[in-house]
């Protein structure tokens, strides 16, 4: 059982052709975070946010990822492919890694409601 | 098989800088799963963590060493090094190398270097 | 900084004894423990982490236990390979700390 506990921004959804945004938060440690990865479904990476080197965003998603707000991400022009589950990865010292999970669903319909609240 | 290597001068005199280097082989020092440790033992004494670094260049050291440790990295070349500065007898030990192994909570140290002996003595 | 206590610091025993050696911590530290052996002029081997848990490669006769402040190492069975010092170290929080170390000794 790891010492902290990572808090996300749950099952999440939001129109096609819109933006959404990706929070985690890690919560109840002293560990220092080095590095926190996002990634898609398909474990590709979509950007990095590292302590020492700042975001970098990978060259498949730049025109549609942007860094923050904090240590989250926002996609922009969403598609229907977009749906699935996204991953936060904490790289921490000395706890380790923690991992974090989002549901994406990506809706035709102009009613889509885009749910942000915080849960564990 | 992954593989940890230090180097360097085995006699540092009082007062100077203490620089080693660890030589990693069979894996990345970029790989973002792990972070990279220097240990030591003063002879017939127990073991003493100097600072741990992550590949981009996050460091943490034992405040016992207060500010006299350096812990870069060149990934590069594969390589973390360890600078001490202002050394004395005291210093003098078996300086070890060591990966901080992935995919458990607080993971321990699970590949260690052979270790190399500086005698600090004019 | 949190310290690691030892004991005892030296033990004799013989090849087959069960031997136990134990690790108290000054604060809990969860189940943030690991065991290591260090023969001379070699470098210490990882042998159990997070408390209970083996290490590939590491024979059986090694096992782990207890979480918070109390920890204890066994050999079930000693072996003429088994002669060492044996090392705990937390990894609960940084500084990280070993404990002195525990030789082991044929009788």
């Known amino acids: 059982m790891m010492t902290g506990t990572i808090e996300t921004t749950g099952n999440i959804s939001a129109k096609k052709g819109g933006s959404v945004i990706l929070q985690c938060h890690l919560s109840s440690t002293m560990a220092q975070v080095t590095q926190v990865n996002w990634e898609q479904h398909d474990h590709s990476l979509l950007a990095i946010r590292n302590a020492e080197l700042g975001w970098h965003i990978y060259p498949a998603f730049k025109d549609r990822v942007a860094p923050g707000p904090g240590l989250g991400l926002t996609l922009q022009s969403l598609t229907m492919n977009d749906t699935g589950e996204y991953f936060c990865t904490y790289h921490t010292y000395p706890d380790g890694t923690y991992r974090g999970r989002i549901f994406l669903e990506v809706l035709e319909s102009s009613v889509a409601e885009h749910s942000a609240r915080f849960q564990i | 098989q992954l593989q940890l290597q230090e180097s360097g001068p085995g006699l540092v005199k009082p007062a100077e800088t203490l620089s080693l280097t660890c030589t990693v082989s069979?894996?990345?020092?970029?790989?973002?799963?792990?972070?990279w440790t220097w240990i030591r033992q003063p002879p017939g004494k127990g073991l003493e963590w100097i600072g741990t670094?992550?590949?981009?260049?996050?460091?943490f050291h034992n405040p016992s060493l207060k500010s006299r440790v350096t812990i870069p990295v060149d990934t590069s070349k594969n390589q973390f090094s360890l600078k001490l500065s202002s050394v004395t007898a005291a210093d003098t030990a078996v300086y070890y190398c060591?990966?901080?192994?992935?995919?458990?909570?607080?993971?321990?140290?699970?590949?260690w270097g052979q270790g190399t002996l500086v005698t600090v003595s004019s | 900084d949190i310290q690691m206590t030892q004991s005892p610091s030296s033990l004799s025993a013989s090849v087959g004894d069960r031997v136990t050696i134990t690790c108290r911590a000054s604060?809990?530290?969860?189940?943030?423990l690991n065991w290591y052996q260090q023969k001379p002029g070699k470098a210490p081997k990882l042998l159990i982490y997070?408390?209970?848990s083996l290490q590939s490669g590491v024979p059986s006769r090694f096992s782990g236990s207890g979480s918070g402040t109390d920890f204890t190492l066994t050999i079930s069975s000693l072996q003429p390979e088994d002669f060492a010092t044996y090392y705990c170290?937390?990894?609960?929080?940084?500084?990280?700390?070993f404990g002195g170390g525990t030789k082991v000794e044929i009788k």
């Open positions: 060591a990966r901080v192994g992935p995919d458990v909570s607080h993971p321990p140290f699970d590949y």
């Open positions: 069979g894996g990345s020092i970029s790989s973002y799963d792990h972070y």
């Open positions: 670094v992550y590949y981009s260049g996050s460091t």
């Open positions: 604060q809990s530290i969860s189940s943030y």
């Open positions: 997070a408390a209970s």
């Open positions: 170290q937390q990894s609960y929080s940084t500084p990280i700390t």
